[in-house]
Interface confidence: low
């Protein structure tokens, strides 16, 4: 369905409000350092232009592609060279190279100040004074810090953000109403950003086939009553949506996502019995609801997989004639029968099956060769099961904070070259798997835990890619998407690492730690723990525990002291000396 003017087409499909919001997100995700006012000006100019094209699709420049229009607009920014350095060179290129160039300069860890939440009254005043600007600023601040945030989903977050302020700014106790809602949005937003980052990494680093395999497995678990052809259609459409969003084509992405939600709801009888409630909601809520919908019940009469994929004499014939479709069917059939497996485990099983067929279909007796292929699955299934069992036991024994500390020590010893802030952030997130997944029954633990770990380890991979410091991290991140977690799990202490020089400044603390929130105080202590391990990678758990207990007691004591700063200075010196003695530094 070719349109004379793509910009007019998208403006009409999405409506002015969503059009403006999506263009703002796109621009903020590309030019992450630009001031808010500059972006608003660019968005308004694009919107006015779009309106002229709606009025007359034959008007000048209306036939240009969105990449051309948006790229031309971004390249008008006066301070591009000073602010972005070599990114300015993108503007010398033609489309589609120019857009690719902008994409390559997206920064997963931009040097931006931490978002500080103002007082509730200040926020409510700002909301009432200019609601539109207030909400645009939210989109801008999230988009520039999360350059791969799933744009149509960010519109859903903004809708909830607006609803929270609308309700709470007229409540008797504004803070009690608003702050929990904002905390929830922040935590959900970080999780949503990380999940989408994995989808984009999957598409960009491992290709469409890898993403489609992931989607076949996940959708087959979610919609086990849907036929293979139906799942294939959904996978094709979903791949298009995510390819567009990850490629910066946010208008097309949002439009296609809406179409996909519409299709799913119109055909829910042949997809899933769980979609009814979702499909009664407005568009943004509907799409979000479908993406999070629980797995449908498995059909009762599913035959054994062995008949088609092992016992049949035609396995190699079928495989040779349509490799990807045959493997897709295998994955579909296995996944719909195993909602208790993680997606990455299902993909490992499919890879093992593929490797076996590649080998056996060239053998003298193929059937004899692949007859025992399902036996090869057993150790692959047991490995994550055992790992989750052990770690959930450890989590239940230690609680979240100490479980995070155990992981901090474990991962710092594996990859000590990685920056301390990255190790702290990633290990804290790895540790959250306990609270998130260990409460679930056995049948839900693995999909919860291992697929969450894939998301967190991808954070490590994208942060490490920006400034690579460890060959081991690079190896685990690039060799196989589905084996990242087993690769990191298998890493032992890095014996080649030369311990970091001791620096007393790293372990010098001040009274400001006393005014920090519990979370911030934990991060300070965990930062110190990582530094300790970097100085003394061979320190035992017992040694590290003793030093950390002393450190906690020191902070508690000095925060209760009358002269806090003096206490931190004097007691801090004693603590450093005692720690050096305890660890033999």
């Amino acid at each position: 369905d070719a349109h004379k003017s793509e910009v007019a087409h998208r403006f009409k499909d999405l409506g002015e409000e969503n059009f403006k919001a999506l263009v703002l997100i796109a621009f903020a995700q590309y030019l992450q350092q630009c001031p808010f006012e500059d972006h608003v000006k660019l968005v308004n100019e694009v919107t006015e232009f779009a309106k002229t094209c709606v009025a007359d699709e034959s008007a000048e420049n209306c036939d240009k592609s969105l990449h051309t229009l948006f790229g031309d607009k971004l390249c008008t920014v006066a301070t591009l060279r000073e602010t972005y350095g070599e990114m300015a060179d993108c503007c010398a290129k033609q489309e589609p190279e120019r857009n690719e160039c902008f994409l390559q300069h997206k920064d997963d860890n931009p040097n931006l100040p931490r978002l500080v939440r103002p007082e509730v009254d200040v926020m409510c005043t700002a909301f009432h004074d200019n609601e539109e600007t207030f909400l645009k600023k939210y989109l801008y601040e999230i988009a520039r810090r999360h350059p791969y945030f799933y744009a149509p989903e960010l519109l859903f977050f903004a809708k909830r953000y607006k609803a929270a302020f609308t309700e709470c700014c007229q409540a008797a106790d504004k803070a009690a109403c608003l702050l929990p809602k904002l905390d929830e949005l922040r935590d959900e937003g970080k999780a949503s950003s990380a999940k989408q980052r994995l989808k984009c990494a999957s598409l960009q680093k491992f290709g469409e086939r890898a993403f489609k395999a992931w989607a076949v497995a996940r959708l087959s678990q979610r919609f086990p009553k849907a036929e293979f052809a139906e799942v294939s259609k959904l996978v094709t459409d979903l791949t298009k949506v995510h390819t567009e969003c990850c490629h910066g084509d946010l208008l097309e992405c949002a439009d296609d996502r809406a179409d996909l939600a519409k299709y799913i709801c119109e055909n829910q009888d042949s997809i899933s019995s769980k979609l009814k409630e979702c499909c009664e909601k407005p568009l943004l809520e509907k799409s979000h609801c479908i993406a999070e919908v629980e797995n449908d019940e498995m059909p009762a009469d599913l035959p054994s997989l062995a008949a088609d994929f092992v016992e049949s004499k035609d396995v190699c014939k079928n495989y040779a004639e349509a490799k990807d479709v045959f493997l897709g069917m295998f994955l579909y059939e296995y996944a719909r029968r195993h909602p208790d497996y993680s997606v990455v485990l299902l993909l490992r099983l499919a890879k093992t099956y593929e490797t076996t067929l590649e080998k056996c279909c060239a053998a003298a007796d193929p059937h004899e060769c692949y007859a025992k292929v399902f036996d090869e699955f057993k150790p692959l299934v047991e490995e994550p099961q055992n790992l989750i069992k052990q770690n959930c036991e450890l989590f239940e024994q230690l609680g979240e904070y100490k479980f995070q500390n155990a992981l901090l020590v474990r991962y710092t010893k594996k990859v000590p070259q990685v920056s301390t802030p990255t190790l702290v952030e990633v290990s804290r997130n790895l540790g959250k798997v306990g609270s998130k997944c260990c409460k679930h029954p056995e049948a839900k633990r693995m999909p919860c835990a291992e697929d969450y770990l894939s998301v967190v380890l991808n954070q490590l991979c994208v942060l490490h890619e920006k400034t690579p410091v460890s060959d081991r991290v690079t190896k685990c991140c690039t060799e196989s998407l589905v084996n990242r977690r087993p690769c990191f799990s298998a890493l032992e202490v890095d014996e080649t690492y030369v311990p970091k020089e001791f620096n007393a400044e790293t372990f010098t603390f001040h009274a400001d730690i006393c005014t920090l929130s519990e979370k911030e105080r934990q991060i300070k202590k965990q930062t110190a723990l990582v530094e300790l391990v970097k100085h003394k990678p061979k320190a035992t758990k017992e040694q590290l525990k003793a030093v950390m207990d002393d450190f906690a007691a020191f902070v508690e004591k000095c925060c209760k002291a009358d002269d806090k700063e003096t206490c931190f200075a004097e007691e801090g010196k004693k603590l450093v000396a005692a720690s050096q003695a305890a660890l033999g530094l």
């Epitope: 259609k233 035959p303 088609d308 014939k317 004639e321 349509a322 479709v325 045959f326 069917m329 059939e333």
Partner: nanobody, 115 residues
Amino acid sequence: QVQLVESGGGLVQPGGSLRLSCAASGFSFGSFGMSWVRQAPGKGPEWVSAIDSGGADTRYAETVKGRFTISRDNAKKTLYLQMNSLKPEDTAVYYCTIGRSTTRGSQGTQVTVSS
């Protein structure tokens, strides 16, 4: 996306004939072996017949041998099943599949053999 749409089913008397068609799209039909599968009420899926990608090699379940003929037209991306001498036990939903799978990839077409 992979799509298979069957047609040609209906109500027929014992001893009668029907010709089923399966229109394929979303994949390179000419590169794939295809099958017909059927599912009778309250029973599991039963493989009926298969044909290789070129149309030279055909196979049949014992229950239909000599009565059913599978064929294909790669130019039209269509699979056929000519069913003669139909019996009441042939009553089922018939659907086509890629390769030799008994997994339903489509809605199928109902065949009812009854006097």
